[in-house]
């Protein structure tokens, strides 16, 4: 009679996480009598997976009925596979004794577990940044196996190239994580922009996972200011407006100063939204000219999103004409926008009135 051989026909088996793994094992002889055991790994630290003779193995079932006469099939099924189950499994024949002794081992079957990556999480900088600045976004995904994975970055559908990606750990592991950092240059038009991290893996069957970050959470577009004098609305009154244009986010506080003294403070509430996602707002100030003997310096001061205030001034000349003539002095705009100005089309805004 030929000596018993333990046959493990599959060198490797790949299973998706959550599924069952079938590990095949047959023996070529009924001799010697003795149980089969399955181990993960070899050597003294090997882990017992199944023992035909004794023990409780809730995740393991035998594929064939091992009690049946002349049974030589000792294949097992392991349920609910996780990445932690990856490894090489050995089917080992034992010889009956006190205790049973190891007789012969199969060549082993390597079980690899295909585990899907977690949904990518994209995070941006802690503080907002202004256009023309470069900001970093990170993307993380965990728990995938095998190690091979592809990560791409997009901004509004356009693939980015300035990024660095690491997959950890470097050596063998039951599962892996990916971490990528991309650099993105902000523009004034980015309020509606999205940064997308896309992860492709063998477990996803060509349907990559995506994580997104809205640049509206990252960008700050500072306002441009323009102070103008409007035609007289009533005798001895001058109407001055402060146009606050193209700002984001909405959080904005405006203060009017007359000759350096605070006249009024208000918070932007009813704003108009531009197509690019930025906001416009307008504030009015009605100045009673007859109450002033000297020229008035009007300043529109804006604090946007907690940043240092920007301001724009307007000099209002008070003439010596008698009041009864009812003529208003022409105003001269001598101020300058400290942040620079642009020629943007403005949407209508709510007019705020204030009488002195």
């Amino acid at each position: 009679e030929e000596e018993l051989q333990v046959i493990q026909p599959d060198k490797s088996v790949s299973v998706a996480a959550g599924e069952s793994a079938i590990l095949h094992c047959t023996v070529t002889s009924l001799i010697p009598v003795g149980p089969i055991q399955w181990f993960r790994g070899a050597g003294p630290a090997r882990e017992l997976i199944y023992n035909q003779k004794e023990g409780h193995f809730p995740r393991v079932t035998t594929v064939s009925e091992s009690t049946k006469r002349e049974n030589m099939d000792f294949s097992i099924s392991i349920s609910n596979i996780t990445p932690a189950d990856a490894g090489t499994y050995y089917c080992v024949k034992f010889r009956k004794g006190s205790p049973d002794t190891e007789f012969k081992s199969g060549a082993g079957t390597e079980l690899s577990v295909r585990a899907k990556p977690s949904a990518p999480v994209v995070s941006g900088p802690a503080a907002r940044a202004t256009p023309q600045h470069t900001v970093s976004f990170t993307c993380e995904s965990h728990g995938f196996s095998p190690r091979d994975i592809t990560l791409k970055w997009f901004k509004n559908g356009n693939e980015l190239s300035d990024f660095q990606t690491n997959v950890d750990p470097v050596g063998e592991s039951v599962s892996y994580s990916i971490h990528s950092t991309a650099k993105v240059v902000l523009t004034r038009e980015d309020v509606h922009s999205q940064v997308i991290c896309e992860v492709a893996h063998v477990t996803l069957q060509g349907d990559p996972l995506r994580g997104t970050a809205n640049l509206s959470e990252t960008i700050r577009v500072p306002p441009t200011l323009e102070v103008t004098q409007q035609p007289v609305r009533a005798e001895n009154q001058v109407n001055v407006t402060c146009q606050v244009r193209k700002f984001y986010p909405q959080r904005l506080q405006l203060t009017w100063l007359e000759n350096g003294n605070v006249s009024r403070t208000e918070t932007a509430s009813t704003v108009t939204e531009n197509k690019d996602g930025t906001y416009n707002w307008m504030s009015w100030l009605l100045v009673n000219v007859s109450a002033h003997r000297d020229d008035v310096k009007l300043t529109c001061q804006v604090e946007h999103d907690g940043q240092p205030a920007v301001s724009k001034s307007h000099d209002l000349k008070v003439s010596a004409h008698p009041k009864e003539q009812g003529s208003n002095t022409a105003a001269e705009n001598t101020g300058s926008n400290e942040r620079g100005s642009s020629d943007y089309k403005d949407d209508d805004d709510k007019h705020h009135h204030h009488h002195h």
């Epitope: 009598v33 004794e54 091992s66 049974n71």
Partner: antibody, heavy 119, light 110 residues
Framework: QVQLVQSGAEVKKPGASVKVSCKAS????????INWVRQAPGQGLEWIAM????????HYNQIFKDRATLTTDTSTSTAYMELRSLRSDDTAVYYC????????????WGRGTLVTVSS | DIVLTQSPDSLAVSLGERATINCRAS??????????IFWYQQKPGQPPKLLIY???NRDSGVPDRFSGSGSGTDFTLTISSLQAEDVAVYYC????????FGQGTKLEIK
């Protein structure tokens, strides 16, 4: 190690029934067949029947088919053999034995239960 | 049914001598490449003990002075050098079909 512990001796009257138990330990009860064998005083071994505790499949010696019933309780790893309509020639030591190789052989034996049938 | 006949019914052998017990089946017990014959030893007041399985394979812990041979219908249990502790009744059993035992052979010391 494998152990099969049998119930104590019984004295029965002709026509009665007896139920002998065999409690297994040291192995997974449902993975191996249990055989029942008897031996009358001064006589040879006589196979009665066998049971697979995993699914209660049984095989009986035709001689005992109508009088013997094998059962198992997997929750307590115990096998039972009931013999009905007892006669005086059923007086014997009744053994349970475990088949470790699914070869329909008897690898490990209990110590036996003496059943005496006498009026 | 297969009937097993052992011979002799009893046997007396001197210590250190060879003892041979025969078992003949009424039909072949060979199947699937195996001879489905088993040998047991039973000492007084004890349950039987498996010695040989599938005709020629010694069970664990069985001294190597015990050996089994044969094929088809004729089988032999041999004790190469009889020891005092070998005094017992020896049974053959077949399981090509359902188990049946031979009538037993009583081995004594001459």
């Amino acid at each position: 190690q494998v152990q099969l512990v049998q119930s104590g001796a019984e004295v029965k009257k002709p026509g009665a029934s007896v139920k002998v138990s065999c409690k297994a330990s040291g192995y997974t009860f449902t993975n191996y067949w249990i055989n029942w064998v008897r031996q009358a005083p001064g006589q040879g071994l006589e196979w009665i029947a066998m049971i697979d505790p995993s699914d209660s499949e049984t095989h009986y010696n035709q001689i005992f088919k109508d009088r013997a019933t094998l059962t198992t309780d997997t929750s307590t790893s115990t096998a039972y053999m009931e013999l009905r309509s007892l006669r005086s020639d059923d007086t014997a030591v009744y053994y349970c034995a475990m088949d470790y190789g699914s070869l329909y052989a008897m690898d490990y034996w209990g110590r036996g239960t003496l059943v005496t049938v006498s009026s | 049914d297969i009937v097993l006949t052992q011979s002799p019914d009893s046997l007396a052998v001197s210590l250190g001598e060879r003892a041979t017990i025969n078992c003949r089946a009424s039909q072949s017990v060979r199947s699937s490449g195996y001879n489905w014959i088993f040998w047991y030893q039973q000492k007084p007041g004890q349950p039987p003990k498996l010695l040989i399985y599938l005709a020629s394979n010694r069970d664990s812990g069985v001294p190597d002075r015990f050996s089994g041979s044969g094929s088809g219908t004729d089988f032999t249990l041999t004790i190469s050098s009889l020891q005092a502790e070998d005094v017992a009744v020896y049974y053959c059993q077949e399981s090509r079909e359902l188990p049946t035992f031979g009538q037993g052979t009583k081995l004594e010391i001459k």
